[in-house]
């Protein structure tokens, strides 16, 4: 049995420039205890998009719409999308560690593509 599943239900999302993009993520458990972060890209060069605990992310808001009994919602919305925001976004669960938290499990990723703003 998996201890926890990270569910990114949408493989891809297409958004017009200037609009907001909602990136969905749900988890089946809070255990193991630890934070959830969003990144664009994978590997060493990935970019932190949102960390609830620290940092300033003025274009990102949390979107908790799921009230399902068996899932916890950790979705985000990014406002004023530009072509530079295109890429694959990962919802990542960390496990509390000492001294540093340890990456535990990542979602499969959601690819964000940006359409030209309608004229």
């Amino acid at each position: 049995e998996d201890e926890l599943q990270v569910i990114q239900p949408e493989k891809s999302v297409s958004v017009a420039a200037g609009e907001s993009a909602t990136l969905r993520c749900a988890m089946t458990s809070l255990i193991p205890v630890g934070p959830i972060m969003w990144f664009r890209g994978a590997g060493a060069g990935r970019e932190l998009i949102y960390n609830q605990k620290e940092g300033h992310f003025p274009r990102v808001t949390t979107v908790s719409e799921l009230t399902k009994r068996n899932n916890l919602d950790f979705s985000i919305s990014i406002s004023n999308i530009t072509p530079a925001d295109a890429g694959t976004y990962y919802c990542v669960k960390f496990r509390k560690g000492s001294p540093d938290d340890v990456e535990f499990k990542s979602g499969a990723g959601t690819e964000l593509s940006v359409r030209a703003k309608p004229s």
Epitope: E1, D2, E3, S29, I36, S75
Partner: antibody, heavy 118, light 112 residues
Framework: EVQLVESGGGLVKPGGSLRLSCAAS????????MSWVRQTPGKGLEWVAT????????YYPNSVKGRFTLSRDNAKNSLYLQMNSLRAEDTAVYYC???????????WGQGTTVTVSS | DIVITQSPASLAVSLGERATISCRAS??????????MHWYQQKPGQPPKLLIY???NLESGVPDRFSGSGSRTDFTLTINPLQAEDVATYYC??????????FGGGTKVEIK
Amino acid sequence: EVQLVESGGGLVKPGGSLRLSCAASGFTFSSYVMSWVRQTPGKGLEWVATISSGGTYTYYPNSVKGRFTLSRDNAKNSLYLQMNSLRAEDTAVYYCVSSMTGSSFDYWGQGTTVTVSS
Amino acid sequence: DIVITQSPASLAVSLGERATISCRASESVDSYGNSFMHWYQQKPGQPPKLLIYRASNLESGVPDRFSGSGSRTDFTLTINPLQAEDVATYYCHQSSEQLPWTFGGGTKVEIK
């Protein structure tokens, strides 16, 4: 119907040990986070221990850390709390609790009483 | 530790009237818009029973006269209208990322 049946409580002297058991039925035990919560007249409800669905991760408050050990046997649908170096302040009713997401305490057993006294 | 202050300690309400119980956490229990505060009912001689999970979600089988609201540090359980079978002690509980998980001190609800 979810059922959680605790056993193993009793009277023990300070410094002694007890092992509490919880037999679970009526749900997919191996998919649930499991916990123990205790209740004393003086301190109300207190979280004691939590274990992940697969048994890999355990959590304790400082009041019991190093003295209590939580384990589970998913093949037997059973949860265990080994309590060592017991103190008078551990006297309480101990409830076995299941949790679908590890967030709220969803279902509670009827409890088993632990009394630590000389 | 996150300390939860629950008030009042006891409450007497007339049948059919509204009962309101408050819990205040010493720091936010929210994460990504989820409020990890829950409410339980305990009747004498029985274990606690989950009523409301994540601040405002009614547990299956719980009558809709029970409702929960709030976010971050301030939460409320409302029983409206109060019925005789609602006489019990009510507890709030936070399960935020910050351990240990803690409970409020309880509110005993009686009929006036």
